[in-house]
Interface confidence: low
C-alpha cells in the first residue's frame, strides 16, 4: 500500500494518500532538522538529510537500526536521492557547492559535480535513463541534467526562480517542480520543454512528489499537505493541515522505484561503485581521488596527495587535471589538530590533537583509530601537551616535540616510548622534522629572547645551532631530502625562508602578503604552506619558473599541511635501518659512509654488543 | 522556547571595567553547534558584534575592540559574561547577547540593556 | 573587514506596495552567507532571513531574500502595517561578522 512521507524538522511522519488521516511520527532519536528524504523499497529503509546535525541518515522503516552513512564535509545538504538499482547515494549540498554519491552506506563517496555549480538544491534520478536533474538557486536559477557520473552537463530550464521539489514521473516521462519565486508548480518534457503551469494561485508550495495521476505538495502559509490531478490542476484536496515547515514529501511505494539498468546485476561487475549512463549504459566508478584501473572496473587508492588540517578535519587534496575538489576524511573526534604526518608504508595517518593532549593515528577511512601518545596520568592530561611530530618511517618512529616538558620524545608507532633524546635547562623544543636519510633531526627552539634552528643527530647528539639571528617565531619546519633544502616559517617576521641541509645558502623564499603562516611541506618541486589568517594555502614554484600560486582559500582554522610522496619500496628496503630497525634496540642512525650505528635515548646507555640499551 | 536576558550595571564611568551577564534557558551550550554572541546598538545607530563564544569554547572578538573584550562561559550556570575594559562615553549603548546556531546567525536575542558611559 | 553598504537608507512606501532593499558587500561573500533581521523601537533585532534566502520560522511568506557573490536583496512583496521598521543585513562569510548601516522603512 502506498502511503506519504514527510520530514518536518526534527520529524519524519507518514500519513495515508487520503484525507483526514491522522500523521504517524516514525520512531528516530536525535533528529534535528531533517531536510531531504527518500527511501528504498526493496530495503524498506528511508534516507534523510539533517542540515542542522549535517548528517545524512537512514533507517529502517519502523525506526530500527538508525545509522548516520555520511557524517562529514557536508553543509546544507538539502536535495538528496536513492538510485535503487545501483544501491547508490546523490546528495546536492548547497554550502559546499557539490553534488555527490556514495553507496548506500555511505562508502566509497566520490564528488561528481563540483564546478560551476550555485547553490544546488533539489535533485531527482532517473536511474535507468542514466540521468540526474538538479535545481540551482544560486544568482541564476536553473533546472540542469547530468549523466549520473558527473558528465554530459546541460542546462534545461534556464528560465524559472528557486525551483524545489523537483519529481519525475517516471510513467508520463514529465518533469515537476515547485517555484519558490513564483508559488506555482510547474511541469515540462524530461528536457525542459513544453512546459505547464499545474498550480498558479498557491501562497508558497514548497515540497513536492508524484504518484500516479495526482501530484502531492506542501504549501509553507497554508501550513498543509494538498494534492491535485498531475495534469490539470484541479481536484484539490487537503491532506492535513496544521504542518509547519515540511521540508520535503514522497510516495513510499514500488512503482515509484522500477525499471533495470546494469548496475542493478552484480553492481556492474565494479569494484566500488556502479553509475549509470545514457542511454542505459553504466560506468565504474571510484572514490573521491582513486584512480579506475585499466580494466575500467576497479580503483586504485592515491599515492601522491596532500594532507591538510584544520581545527576539527583532516583533509586530502590531489594534483590532477581535473582540479579534483579536495575531501574531508572520515576520522571521528577531532577536537583541536595541531600537526599531522603520514606513514606511507602502513597509509596510516598521524595527528596531534591539543584539545586532548594526545598523539592518535588511523587509516584513510577513519578505521583502526589508536591512541599512540596519551599522557600516563588519565586524569592529567596536561602532564603532557604533544606540539609537533615527525616520522622515522624506517625506524618506525614517531619524534615529538613537548609544551608541558620542553624535550624532544621518541615512540614506536605502535605507542611503546622509546624515550627522550633531547633536553636542556633552557630548552624550548616546537617545531620538529627528521631527515633519517642523513640520520639528523632539526628542530625549533622557541628560547626566550633568543629563538633558534638547531640540527642534532637523532639520538639528540652532535647538537649544533644553524640559525640564532634573523629569527623572531620560527613556528614551521619542513625538509626535502631529495633537494637537500631545509624550509622553515616565522610567524612573526611573516617570511619563508630555506637553507642547505648544513645551515648553508640561507635565502628569503617569500615575504610579501603573508600574515599567519603555520605549515608547509614540500611536493615535488614547489612549496606549499598555510596561512591561518588569510584562511587561505599557497605555494611557490622553487625553480622560480612559475611563481607563487593560490591553491585554495576560505579555509578556517587552518593548521597544518603535509604532502605525501609515493613511497619506492625498493629504495626504502635499502635504507640500513629498514630492516629490523638495524638491529638496534632503541636508535638506528644512518653514519655518512651510509652503515648504521645504534644509539639510545637520555637515560639508557648503549651495551657492550653495540646494539642493545640498558641501564648506565 | 529559548530565552536569553542581559544584565549589568546602567552606568559605567569612564576608564572603568563593564562586566555583562547573559543568562539563557531553552538550550545548552554543551550542545554541538551552539553559540552566544554579544553584540551592541548606540542610541540612534547600527548594530555592532562584538564577540561569540560557541560550544566548543572557540571565541572571536571584533577587530578595532579586540584588545578591549573577553568572553567566557559558565555551561552550568547557562551563562556567559563580557568583560570591555576602558569605557568611554562613546560606548554607551544598548548591549544585547543573542543565541547563534552555526552558520553564525543569531537567531534568539535578549531585550537588550542600556549602559550609559558617564562621569 | 567587509563593509556592507545598505540603500537606500530611508524608504518611504505606503502598505500594500512592494519594498525592496539593497545590500552590497565590499567582497565576494558567497551565495548563503547573509542574513536579515528587522528591528522595530524599543525592540531587539529579529532574524527574517538566513543563508540569503531561507526564511526563518515564523516569518511571512511576504519576505524573501536573494542574491549571490556581492549584491543581496530583501524583498517585502505587499507592506503590512507591522513591517515599518528599520532592516539590517549581516555577512557571516568571513570574521568578523558585520552589520549594515540599516534601512528604514517608514510609512508615506
Known amino acids: 500500500e502506498a502511503f506519504l512521507l514527510f520530514s518536518r524538522r526534527a520529524d519524519i511522519r507518514r500519513i495515508s494518500l487520503e484525507t483526514n488521516n491522522n500523521n504517524v511520527a516514525i520512531p528516530l532519536t536525535g533528529v534535528k532538522e531533517a531536510s531531504a528524504l527518500d527511501f528504498d523499497v526493496t530495503d524498506n529503509r528511508i534516507y534523510w538529510t539533517d542540515i542542522s546535525l549535517k548528517t545524512i541518515s537512514r533507517a529502517f522503516m519502523n525506526g530500527s537500526a538508525l545509522e548516520h552513512v555520511v557524517e562529514f564535509g557536508l553543509d546544507y545538504p538539502e536535495g538528496m536521492a536513492v538510485d535503487w538499482l545501483g544501491k547508490n547515494l546523490y546528495w546536492a549540498d548547497t554550502g559546499t557547492n557539490r553534488i555527490e554519491v556514495s553507496k548506500l552506506d555511505g562508502q566509497h563517496r566520490q564528488v561528481l559535480v563540483w564546478k560551476d555549480l550555485d547553490s544546488p538544491r533539489a535533485l531527482a534520478l532517473d536511474p535507468a535513463e542514466g540521468f540526474m536533474y538538479w535545481t540551482e538557486w544560486g544568482g541564476k536559477p536553473k533546472i540542469d541534467r547530468a549523466a549520473m557520473d558527473g558528465s554530459e552537463r546541460t542546462t534545461l530550464v534556464p528560465n524559472v526562480g528557486r525551483a524545489n521539489g523537483l519529481t519525475i514521473d517516471y510513467a508520463k516521462r514529465r518533469l515537476y517542480w515547485t517555484d519558490l519565486d513564483t508559488n506555482l508548480i510547474e511541469s515540462s518534457n524530461m528536457l525542459g520543454l513544453n512546459r505547464e503551469v499545474i498550480a498558479d494561485d498557491l501562497p508558497h508550495p514548497f515540497g513536492l512528489t508524484q504518484y500516479q495521476d495526482y501530484i502531492y505538495w506542501t504549501d509553507w502559509s497554508r501550513r498543509s499537505i494538498e494534492r491535485a490531478n498531475k495534469t490539470s490542476g484541479q481536484n484539490r484536496t487537503i491532506i492535513q493541515g496544521h504542518l509547519d515547515y515540511v521540508m520535503d514529501i514522497l510516495v513510499f511505494h514500488s512503482s515509484r522505484q522500477s525499471g533495470w539498468n546494469e548496475c542493478a546485476s552484480s553492481n556492474g561487475h565494479c569494484s566500488h561503485l556502479c553509475l549509470a549512463v545514457p542511454v542505459g549504459g553504466f560506468v565504474c566508478g571510484c572514490p573521491a581521488h582513486y584512480s579506475l584501473n585499466a580494466d575500467n572496473r576497479t580503483c586504485s587508492a592515491p599515492t601522491t596527495f596532500l594532507l591538510f588540517s584544520q581545527k576539527s578535519a583532516i583533509n586530502r587534496m590531489v594534483i590532477d587535471e581535473q582540479q579534483s575538489p579536495d575531501i574531508i576524511l572520515p576520522i571521528h573526534s577531532l577536537r583541536n589538530v595541531r600537526a599531522i604526518d603520514y606513514d606511507p608504508l602502513d597509509k596510516q595517518l598521524y595527528w596531534i590533537d591539543s584539545r586532548q593532549n594526545m598523539i592518535r593515528k588511523a587509516q584513510e577511512d577513519g578505521s583502526q583509530g589508536f591512541t599512540v601518545v596519551v599522557s600516563s596520568v588519565p586524569s592529567q592530561n596536561l602532564e603532557i601537551q604533544p606540539y609537533d611530530l615527525s616520522i622515522d618511517i624506517y625506524s618506525r618512529y614517531i619524534y615529538w616535540t613537548c609544551e608541558a616538558t620542553n624535550v624532544i620524545n621518541v615512540t614506536r608507532l605502535d605507542g611503546r616510548s622509546v624515550g627522550v633524546v633531547l633536553k636542556g635547562e633552557q630548552d624550548r623544543p616546537r617545531a620538529v622534522v627528521v631527515n633519517p636519510e642523513k640520520g639528523y633531526m632539526y628542530f625549533t627552539n622557541l628560547q626566550e629572547r633568543s629563538p633558534k634552528i638547531e640540527r642534532a643527530a637523532l639520538d639528540g647528539t652532535e647538537r649544533e645551532v644553524l640559525f640564532f639571528s634573523g629569527l623572531s617565531k620560527p613556528i614551521a619546519l619542513a625538509l626535502d631530502s631529495r633537494l637537500g633544502k631545509l624550509f622553515w616559517a616565522d610567524s612573526d617576521l611573516r617570511r619563508i625562508e630555506s637553507s642547505d641541509l648544513s645551515g648553508a645558502n640561507r635565502i628569503v623564499l617569500e615575504d610579501s602578503n603573508i600574515l599567519q603562516p603555520v605549515g608547509l611541506t614540500v611536493f615535488e618541486n614547489w612549496l606549499y604552506w598555510i596561512d591561518k589568517q588569510q584562511q587561505m594555502i599557497e605555494k611557490i614554484d622553487m625553480t622560480g619558473r612559475e611563481g607563487r600560486t593560490k591553491v585554495q582559500a576560505r579555509i578556517a582554522q587552518l593548521s597544518d599541511i603535509h604532502a605525501v610522496k609515493e613511497l619506492n619500496l625498493q629504495e626504502y628496503r635499502q635504507h640500513p635501518c629498514a630492516q629490523d630497525n638495524g638491529g638496534c634496540s632503541h636508535i638506528c642512525l644512518v653514519k655518512g659512509d651510509g652503515t648504521t650505528r645504534c644509539s639510545c635515548p637520555m637515560h639508557l646507555v648503549l651495551l657492550q654488543d653495540e646494539l642493545s640499551c640498558g641501564e648506565p | 522556547q529559548v530565552q536569553l536576558k542581559e544584565s549589568g550595571p546602567a552606568l559605567v564611568k569612564p576608564t572603568q571595567t563593564l562586566t555583562l551577564t547573559c543568562t539563557f534557558s531553552g538550550f545548552s551550550l554543551s550542545n554541538r553547534g551552539g553559540g552566544v554572541g554579544w553584540i551592541r546598538q548606540p542610541p540612534g545607530k547600527a548594530l555592532e558584534w562584538l564577540a561569540w563564544i560557541d560550544w566548543d569554547d572557540d571565541k572571536s572578538y571584533s577587530t578595532s575592540l579586540k584588545t578591549r573584550l573577553t568572553i567566557s562561559k559558565d555551561t552550568s550556570k547557562n551563562q556567559v559574561v563580557l568583560t570591555m575594559t576602558n569605557m568611554d562615553p562613546v560606548d554607551t549603548a544598548t548591549y544585547y547577547c543573542a543565541r547563534f546556531h552555526l552558520p553564525l546567525v543569531f537567531d534568539s536575542w535578549g531585550q537588550g540593556t542600556l549602559v550609559t558611559v558617564s562621569s | 573587514d567587509i563593509v556592507l553598504t545598505q540603500s537606500p537608507a530611508t524608504l518611504s512606501l505606503s502598505p500594500g506596495e512592494r519594498a525592496t532593499l539593497s545590500c552590497r558587500a565590499s567582497q565576494f561573500i558567497g551565495s548563503r552567507y547573509l542574513a536579515w533581521y528587522q528591528q522595530k523601537p524599543g525592540q531587539a533585532p529579529r532574524l527574517l532571513i538566513y543563508?540569503?534566502?531561507n526564511r526563518a520560522t515564523g516569518v511571512p511568506a511576504r519576505f524573501s531574500g536573494s542574491g549571490s557573490g556581492t549584491d543581496f536583496t530583501l524583498t517585502i512583496s505587499s507592506l503590512e502595517p507591522e513591517d515599518f521598521a528599520t532592516y539590517y543585513c549581516?555577512?557571516?562569510?568571513?570574521?568578523?561578522?558585520?552589520f549594515g548601516q540599516g534601512t528604514k522603512v517608514e510609512i508615506k
Open positions: 543563508g540569503a534566502s
Open positions: 549581516q555577512q557571516y562569510y568571513d570574521y568578523p561578522q558585520t
